[in-house]
Structures are given as structure tokens and as C-alpha cells.
């Protein structure tokens, strides 16, 4: 990950340095699991494509109780710090599938990487 | 420990300039929204302006076209540009680490006083 | 926009009592089943404080005497038992619609 450190990307993204924290913060998360993560709890599944960040904070803002996961949401408000207007990015509630947080996290901490590697930090 | 140490307040006359800015520690900078709130002499709170790790900004609409906030990741620090003061603009700013519409702003700095008068 | 309307402007408590307040919002601010209504303690010459995010939930290393309720338009802070450096004013803000918005503010007096 340290390689793509200062990939320059146009207009306002998150910076390389905030995915690159978000990625470390994912991985501590599924490296310090030891119990089922946030007591297999469920949550939405989400589109990992536009809008992605907004919706990965709305769907996993619904576990509740869970300190194992407040700093992702946290962090993941960084991108998404106000609420999204209706209308805007219309597929953050389209709820057909539900996975355990534990897969929710190994699913964004994939894409994430890739996005990472592609030097994609919108 | 979280720190936000605000700068750059004082006096202006109406329709000057002032740019604040806002020295931030103890936390991943770029990893976190940041806002200006303000309060005027012996008011309530008002929210001025937020903008995202990516760099999105938000404003209401009575600062909206005279205000203009940003951030230097690199510096880890927020600035406010404030053109067009007006007399209603005079407060205390405060620079604040906004975690989120589900967190509110969890940290504040001290303050900073802008007074705009002729 | 939406306005929040805080009662009472001020109140006395007596230490080991319990102080309530309450904050209306003009309009709902549920999102999705979520309150976006957070409280915040300022005491005097300092700047606020977060005590309370999404209307019942105690922001970390505030003393577990706050406590939060409420859901779409009408919401509570209750200090119980209150003590003497809780003097300050309390402001109640809403995040489910720009402008985020205040309400004005309680301020809390220990007798």
C-alpha cells in the first residue's frame, strides 16, 4: 500500500493517505477478530461502486454496541460527513441481501485494496 | 491527544477580509471531516461550514459565496476565508472535528474572536 | 430550515437532584430509524463539549449521571444526580438536514 502513498488525484477525493488509514483500520478489524465480529451481527450489503462510502456507513451504522467497528464508522464518516440528500445516490437503500458484519468488512477491505492498487480514491 | 488550536481572529471593518486557521493534532487529520462553528457575544451556537476528508464542502446559505473553507492535509490544518464581513459575522469561531452526522462534532478548539466594526 | 426549540431557558438544581431537558424540533429528524439529534455541554469561558450523539448514545468518557432519549421531533437530556460543576449551558443540534442547526440553549444553575 505504502508505494501508492502520494498518487496525485484531481478535485475533491479522499486522498490516498485517508483510504490508505481506512484499509489499515479494516485490517486490524479482521486481524484482531477472535469472537464473531460484533456478535454476528447482520447488515445490508451494499453496491461497491458509486457513492460506496455513504453506503457502507449506512448500512453498518445499524450494529449497534459494537466499539470493534465505531472508528471504521467514524472514519468512513470522514467521506461522507453530511447526510446525503434524497434522490442522491438512490442504491445507499436498496436492501435485498444481508451478510454478517464479519463478511461486510472482508468485502469493503477487498474493494478497497483494489481501489488502492488502481490509484482510485473517489 | 485530540488538539485544535484555532488562529487568525480580530478586528475588521465591514466588508473586509480575514482568513482563520486551525492547527489540528493528536489524531489522523486526513482521516476526518472538519467544520467552523461560531458563536456571536452571549448567543447559541451557529454551524458555518464543513468539508470532507476527499475535500467536499458544505456551507449554509448565510455564508454561502463569502466564506470558504479548506484544508492542508499535508499541514494537518483548516482554514476559513472570510471575505464580505458584515457586523452580524462577529463571534467567536470555532474549529471542530465533525465525526459525522451520526457523531456530531466530537472535538472543539478554544476559539477564536472575529469582530467586524467600523 | 429546521428550528429546535429548547425548555427551560434556565433552570436550579440542587446537587444529588435531577435536571431535565427538552429540545422540539420543528420537523422530524429520524433518518432511517436513526435520531440525528446530539447534545453538547458548554461551560462557562470554554468551548462545548459533545455529550450525547444520536439522541441516547454517551459520547465516550462522559459520566454515565447524562443520559439521552427521544426520537423524531421531541428529545431529552437528563443529568441525574447532578453535581456542582455541571453548571453550563447545554445546546441540543440536529444533523439530518442542512443547515444543521441549534437549539439555544438551557442553562443549567446548581444551587
Known amino acids: 500500500l505504502t508505494c501508492l502513498g502520494g498518487f496525485a488525484s484531481p478535485g475533491p477525493v479522499p486522498p490516498s493517505t485517508a483510504l490508505r488509514e481506512l484499509i489499515e483500520e479494516l485490517v486490524n478489524i479482521t486481524q484482531n477478530q477472535k469472537a464473531p465480529l460484533c456478535n454476528g451481527s447482520m447488515v445490508w450489503s451494499i453496491n461497491l461502486t458509486a457513492g460506496m462510502y455513504c453506503a457502507a456507513l449506512e448500512s453498518l451504522i445499524n450494529v449497534s454496541g459494537c466499539s470493534a467497528i465505531e472508528k471504521t464508522q467514524r472514519m468512513l464518516s470522514g467521506f461522507c460527513p453530511h447526510k446525503v440528500s434524497a434522490g442522491q445516490f438512490s442504491s445507499l437503500h436498496v436492501r435485498d441481501t444481508k451478510i454478517e458484519v464479519a463478511q461486510f468488512v472482508k468485502d469493503l477491505l477487498l474493494h478497497l485494496k483494489k481501489l488502492f492498487r488502481e490509484g482510485q480514491f473517489n | 491527544e485530540v488538539q485544535l488550536v484555532e488562529s487568525g481572529g480580530g478586528l475588521v471593518k465591514p466588508g473586509g477580509s480575514l482568513r482563520l486557521s486551525c492547527a489540528a493534532s493528536g489524531f489522523t487529520f486526513i482521516s476526518y471531516a472538519m467544520s467552523w462553528v461560531r458563536q456571536a457575544p452571549g448567543k447559541g451556537l451557529e454551524w458555518v461550514s464543513s468539508i470532507s476528508s476527499g475535500g467536499n464542502t458544505y456551507y449554509p446559505d448565510s455564508v454561502k459565496g463569502r466564506f470558504t473553507i479548506s484544508r492542508d492535509n499535508a499541514k494537518n490544518s483548516l482554514y476559513l476565508q472570510m471575505n464580505s464581513l458584515r457586523a452580524e459575522d462577529t463571534a467567536v469561531y470555532y474549529c471542530?472535528?465533525?465525526?459525522?452526522?451520526?457523531?456530531?462534532?466530537?472535538?472543539w478548539g478554544q476559539g477564536t474572536t472575529v469582530t467586524v466594526s467600523s | 430550515d429546521i428550528v429546535l426549540t429548547q425548555s427551560p431557558a434556565s433552570l436550579a438544581v440542587s446537587p444529588g437532584q435531577r435536571a431535565t431537558i427538552t429540545c422540539k424540533a420543528s420537523e422530524s429528524v429520524d433518518n432511517y430509524g436513526k435520531s440525528l439529534m446530539h447534545w453538547y455541554q458548554q461551560k462557562p469561558g470554554q468551548p462545548p463539549k459533545l455529550l450525547i450523539y444520536?439522541?441516547?448514545n454517551l459520547e465516550s468518557g462522559v459520566p454515565a449521571r447524562f443520559s439521552g432519549s427521544g426520537s423524531g421531533t421531541d428529545f431529552t437530556l437528563t443529568i441525574n444526580p447532578v453535581e456542582a460543576n455541571d453548571t453550563a449551558n447545554y445546546y441540543c443540534?440536529?444533523?439530518?438536514?442542512?443547515?444543521?442547526?441549534f437549539g439555544g440553549g438551557t442553562k443549567v444553575e446548581i444551587k
Open positions: 471542530a472535528r465533525l465525526d459525522g452526522y451520526y457523531f456530531g462534532f466530537a472535538y
Open positions: 444520536r439522541a441516547s
Open positions: 443540534q440536529q444533523s439530518n438536514e442542512d443547515p444543521w442547526t
